[in-house]
């Protein structure tokens, strides 16, 4: 009569859709020669197998190419490999060893496969820092994808100039040459599993290192409204005794170090202010002349100068004719 054997391990297995799972099966150690035949995996209640090594037997259309019997009688292996898992694979399965010439065979216990929603997301890795104008290789990887599954489709989305690099079953490389304006923009890697029709994505914000491109000086003069200087200015008239506040501002990432110098500084000159703010509480003859703001950055420096011209109050000048 029909002989029965127990599948080792759990009574149910869980797999995320689009991924792979191995349903373990070991043939009985005592297997009479006459019982030896082909291996068949069946969906509970079905007559057509989902996988078999019988060359004359058809398998279910739904599982063809995705379900495989891993047949190795020497190692007593009769496991079922499922790749590109789909929601409708959610069912109970059993294995049967049988020769078509024989009335009986060996039938295993049932095992349930539960197919859950895909929760894994791609990883995006960046080697070191992204520098403006320098190519960097970004890798989008799905290490949890099995090698034998249908290779996923990788898609990249970015405003930055990019080109596709090599890919494997589990990863895709994107070469990016970012520009200053790409800093803080989004980059998305989208991975589609065609075998199961599932798409996952991950989005990161680009952190692009770039040297200052623009330096500006905002001038606060007494109570009057501030005005901005965007380029070197030859002469700025200022009333003697007036309070002046010079605010230097520069872009760049990470932020540039701002410092103020009187005159046109040499590289190793000592600043009069180590911040972007220069307070001149009472403008006098000592303040007449050039002031320079330098924006220092590991990737390059930029500076802007303005020249102060002091207007003297008529009663304020000493001596006479």
């Amino acid at each position: 009569q029909e002989r029965r054997f127990q599948l080792e391990g759990p009574e149910s297995l869980t797999v995320q859709e689009g991924l792979c799972v191995l349903v373990p099966c070991r043939l009985p150690t005592t297997l009479p020669a006459s019982y030896y035949g082909y291996g068949y995996w069946f969906l509970e209640g079905a007559d057509v197998p989902v996988a078999t090594n019988d060359p004359d037997e058809e398998v279910q259309e739904e599982t063809r190419g995705r379900f495989h019997l891993l047949w190795d009688p020497r190692r007593k292996n009769c496991s079922l490999s499922i790749r590109d898992a789909r929601r409708r694979d959610n069912a109970a399965y059993f294995f049967r060893l049988k020769s078509k010439w024989m009335k009986y065979g060996y039938t295993s216990s049932k095992l349930s496969v539960r197919v859950m929603a895909l929760t894994h997301r791609p990883n995006i890795s960046i080697p070191g820092t992204l520098e403006s104008g320098h190519p960097s290789n970004l890798t989008c990887s799905v290490p949890w994808v099995c090698e034998q599954g249908t290779p996923p489709i990788f898609s990249w989305m970015s405003a930055a100039p990019t080109s596709l690099g090599p890919r494997t079953t589990q990863s895709s490389v994107l070469t990016i040459t970012p520009r200053p304006q790409d800093h803080s923009t989004n980059l998305t890697c989208q991975v589609t599993f065609p075998g199961a029709g599932v798409t996952m994505e991950r989005t990161i914000q680009l952190n692009v290192s770039y040297a200052p491109q623009k330096v500006a000086i905002s001038i606060f003069q007494g109570n009057s409204a501030a005005f901005k200087i965007l380029q070197n200015t030859s002469s700025l008239p200022v009333l003697e005794g007036q309070a002046l506040r010079l605010l230097c501002d520069a872009d760049g990432n990470p932020p540039a170090h701002l410092s103020w110098f009187q005159g046109f500084p040499a590289l190793n000159a000592t600043p009069i202010s180590n911040t972007g703010v220069l307070e001149l509480p009472q403008v006098g003859s000592a303040e007449e002349g050039d002031f320079t703001c330098r924006a220092q950055h590991p990737l390059g420096s930029l500076q802007i100068s303005l020249s102060l011209f002091v207007h003297w109050k008529p009663e304020g000048r000493a001596g006479g004719v």
Partner: antibody, heavy 116, light 107 residues
């Protein structure tokens, strides 16, 4: 004890027919596939035919297809081989054997000689 | 049809020798290979099935290996009763063809 006993062999003229029988005992005959295998004098084994446990499925070697018919009677625990249009090259010891894809029990064989 | 080719056709060896007989299939037959021993005037006897499974009651000096198209029967230490003819047979698809046999003789 599992036993297979062939009978019906003998000398027959080319073109004539012969029916071999195989009586099975010691096992549930109706659960097993059965084979016929032959061996010409001084030659190797040649697989001839197989029949499923219930007789619904049969396969033959190309050399006998259309001339030989394998059948069984489970109520009598007997396997048959009907051989028609016999040729000289069918001369051999015919073994009845038990098994599915593996033959595990063999009978002692019966000699068939096709000669004019 | 699947053609089974055994080598060598005949082999001379002495008691205690290690002997290897090979069988090659014309196409992949997975592990569906059986080995039989036949002595003169006797019916064949099953030794190995499923390429490597030892039939009940067969001495452990007999072993089988292989998968796909290439298979081996090994007798680790020949005994006097092992001198016989050995046949491989594929049971992957009908017709279930035999190899031509390997006659093992006393040296």
């Amino acid at each position: 004890e599992v036993q297979l006993l062939e009978s019906g062999g003998g000398v027959v003229q080319p073109g004539r027919s012969l029916r071999l029988s195989c009586a099975a005992s010691g096992f549930t005959f109706s659960s097993y596939g059965m084979h016929w295998v032959r061996q010409a004098p001084g030659k190797g084994l040649e697989w001839v035919a197989v029949i499923s446990y219930d007789g619904s499925n049969k396969h033959y070697a190309d050399s006998v297809k259309g001339r030989f018919t394998i059948s069984r009677d489970n109520s009598k625990n007997t396997l048959y081989l009907q051989m028609n249009s016999l040729r000289a090259e069918d001369t051999a010891v015919y073994y009845c054997a038990r098994g599915g894809q593996t033959i595990d029990i063999w009978g002692q064989g019966t000699m068939v000689t096709v000669s004019s | 049809d699947i053609v089974m080719t055994q080598s060598p056709s005949s082999l001379s060896a002495s008691v205690g020798d290690r002997v290897t007989i090979t069988c090659r299939a014309s196409q992949s037959i997975s592990s569906y290979l059986n080995w039989y021993q036949q002595k003169p005037g006797k019916a064949p006897k099953l030794l190995i099935y499923a390429a490597s499974s030892l039939q009940s009651g067969v001495p452990s000096r007999f072993s089988g290996s292989g998968s796909g198209t290439d298979f081996t029967l090994t007798i680790s230490s020949l005994q006097p009763e092992d001198f016989a003819t050995y046949y491989c047979q594929q049971s992957y698809s009908t017709p279930y063809t035999f190899g031509q046999g390997t006659k093992l003789e006393i040296k």
